[in-house]
């Protein structure tokens, strides 16, 4: 049986990302130039190493985190290093034009690309709901609108809400998630007869998978303290980051087993699970005064992570199309929302004890900015769907969603790869 | 003890440029954000420049943005400001100053306070032809 | 950009009395407020952070309160090295900017 390939993308990819790329090219050649002050070369390498950190975080971490699919492993990996490529870029001139570009030029810093670095991250949070149904040139437009996003998301939450760098960025754990969901519920829903294998996973990539989850483990501390301004604010969060992950593997496990009839282990389960605890704790990492508080939330973190595994897939693969193996988008949104909910509660609490009588309305602008990173992310991500809805973009067709094949050059075009 | 020497003002034509320099000792130089700030004659205080322990982050006030850059080496425990484009309006004695940050253990969470802590004793500039 | 409003901008008090300085900011700056003394041809000096929390060495008769947009630095008996100019200070997380009060000259009666 011939194989029924999609429309070529050859003609639609290369021409929007290479002129998109020359773009981005002019805009760096007369908006910016490197911050030339530094005198210290120790401290620049030891300020680059958390960019490090989140690089290898998103490059590696969740590049193989989402490669767990049978028959879309190498797109998954290669497609988030594209992103990120591209969504370091823009976020770059994005967050030098609506922060410092009345001043003339955008001056690039190793904080700037940090910055760059964790927005790109958006996008490939986001990006696990649609992975599999979209081409390269989609997922351009994908990094575009959503960087955009949420450097505006983060913009307007700043100058509303007058928070620092950290607080705002710490939304993109709810933002990403909800963008992700609602791209997924506008694109192609079912999947037709015979299609069905290809969005299982299969073992090689599923230990793949599990290597993109135990880097993510391993750098969530400098992901949640990269951007906190002192040395006793990083040093809190990455030890409250540290405790909470931790819990959170040893619940994920437990708990996976705890929650199969036979008592066995699920991958897809664990996958997600063990990040749980860096999730929740990402608002709040900072504040969390104590190493039990933090594990507390760990273990909560990953039993609901568990149960949100076992029950939400069902739905999500119902209403948004959404394969059983893709958890980031609903277990980023449940944690998300926990992580918010952890914040607002530490305020209450510790308000109400020492008798101050801002508590209504602090607790009143943490709600807000909640809600307005959840509108933002649900608004611009319907407007991602409805623009990668158009016929321009060559979308795959259905029978061919979760196929490597599509994309990629094989010496040997076995059908069963 | 803990001290901050300012040095580098002088009497400068505008349009030139001058380089401050703050010597710190006796504490952990990398452990603390720092600033400048200005206070022109008979005048009160004008926040300048801030930079992060590390040297990751830098804010000017609008009155320099562009034309002061803040910076530190934080082998030799020295900050800088490089002052370039003087002008009149930037005739003042200029303080380094250490960004305190001190964290407050509440019941249920820490709260993170700033402040200025310690002051040199200043370095004039005087812009003038 | 946060203008912060410091009032009286002369404050005539005898020793021993109490004094009350008043700073008001144009929008809210939560508790990031902080009070500063400086004498003359002398650098500032750190008094007050998180608009109530006196810094290390200062004495007790020196108290800030506030919150919001409306701060108050209180000294209970005053000394005769309390006469100085007092500053008010906010930092404000976005944009990152920190701005002084143009600041209150506590003169003796």
């Known amino acids: 049986m011939s194989s029924k390939y999609p429309r070529s993308v050859r003609r639609c990819l290369p021409l929007w990302a290479l002129t998109l790329e020359a773009a981005l090219i002019l805009l760096f050649y007369f908006f910016t130039h490197y911050d030339a002050s530094l005198e210290d070369q120790k401290g620049l390498v030891a300020s680059y190493q958390v960019g490090q950190d989140l690089t290898v975080m998103a490059a590696i971490g969740l590049g193989f985190l989402t490669s767990s699919f049978r028959r879309h492993s190498w797109s998954s990996v290669a497609f988030n290093l594209f992103m990120l490529a591209l969504g370091v870029q823009w976020a770059i001139l994005l967050d030098g034009f609506l922060s410092q570009f009345p001043s003339g030029k955008v001056v690039i810093t190793l904080f700037s690309i940090r910055l760059a670095t964790m927005s790109a991250l958006s996008v490939l949070i986001s990006v696990d709901a649609v992975l599999g149904k979209v081409n390269l040139a989609q997922l351009v437009v994908m990094v575009l609108v959503e960087v955009t996003a949420l450097g505006n998301l983060r913009m307007v939450i700043s100058n509303i809400f007058n928070t620092d760098y950290h607080m705002n960025m710490m939304h993109i754990y709810v933002f990403a998630a909800y963008f992700g969901l609602s791209v997924a519920w506008c694109l192609p829903k079912p999947l037709p007869e015979g299609t069905e294998d290809k969005d299982q996973t299969a073992t090689i990539p599923s230990l793949s998978a599990m290597l993109g989850a135990l880097f993510l483990w391993m750098f969530w501390p400098s992901f949640n303290s990269a951007l906190l301004r002192s040395p006793i604010e990083r040093k809190n969060a990455v030890f409250n980051t540290y405790y909470a992950v931790a819990v959170s593997v040893v619940t994920a496990i437990s708990g996976s087993s705890l929650a199969h009839p036979q008592g066995k282990i699920s991958k897809t389960y664990v996958h997600s699970a063990v990040l749980a605890g860096g999730v929740a704790v990402g608002t709040s990492c900072h504040l969390i005064p104590s190493p039990w508080l933090a594990m507390v939330l760990g273990l909560v973190a990953g039993l609901i992570s568990v149960g949100g595994a076992k029950y939400l897939p069902g739905c999500c693969n119902r209403v948004l199309g959404i394969p059983h193996s893709s958890i980031m988008g609903y277990n980023f949104s449940l944690l998300g929302l926990l992580g918010e909910i952890i914040y607002i509660v530490l305020l209450v609490l510790d308000t109400v004890g020492a008798g101050n009588g801002m508590i209504g309305f602090q607790v009143l602008l943490s709600i807000g900015e909640l809600s307005l990173a959840i509108v933002i992310a649900l608004m611009s991500g319907l407007l991602t769907g409805l623009l990668l809805n158009l016929k321009i973009w060559k979308a795959p067709h259905e029978a061919k969603y979760f196929d490597d094949q599509v994309f990629w050059k094989f010496p040997h075009l076995a059908v069963g790869f | 003890q803990v001290q901050l020497v300012e040095s580098g003002g002088g009497v400068v034509q505008p349009g030139r440029s001058l380089r401050l320099s703050c010597a710190a000792s006796g504490f952990t130089f990398s452990s603390y954000g720092m600033h400048w700030v200005r206070q022109a004659p008979g005048k009160g205080l004008e926040w300048v420049a801030v930079?992060?322990?590390?040297?990751?982050?830098?804010y000017y006030a609008d009155s320099v943005k562009g034309r002061f850059t803040i910076s530190r080496d934080n082998s030799k425990n020295t900050l800088y400001l490089q002052m370039n484009s003087l002008r009149a309006e930037d005739t003042a004695v200029y303080y380094c100053a250490r960004d305190m940050v001190t964290m407050v253990r509440g019941a249920y969470r820490n709260y993170y306070y700033y402040g200025m802590d310690v002051w040199g004793k200043g370095t004039t500039v005087t812009v003038s032809s | 950009e946060i203008v912060m409003t410091q009032s009286p901008a002369t404050l005539s008090v005898s020793p021993g009395e109490r004094a009350t300085l008043s700073c008001r900011a144009s929008?809210?700056?939560?508790?990031?407020l902080a009070w500063y003394q400086q004498k003359p041809g002398q650098a500032p000096r750190l008094l007050i952070y998180g608009a109530s929390t006196r810094a290390t060495g200062i004495p007790a008769r020196f108290s800030g309160s506030g919150s919001g947009t409306e701060f108050t630095l209180t000294i209970s008996s005053l000394q005769s090295e309390d006469f100085a100019v007092y500053y008010c200070?906010?930092?404000?997380?976005?944009?990152?900017?920190?701005?002084f009060g143009q600041g209150t000259k506590l003169e003796i009666k």
């Open positions: 930079i992060w322990y590390d040297g990751s982050n830098k």
């Open positions: 200070q906010q930092y404000n997380n976005w944009p990152t900017l920190y701005t």
């Open positions: 929008q809210s700056v939560s508790s990031n």
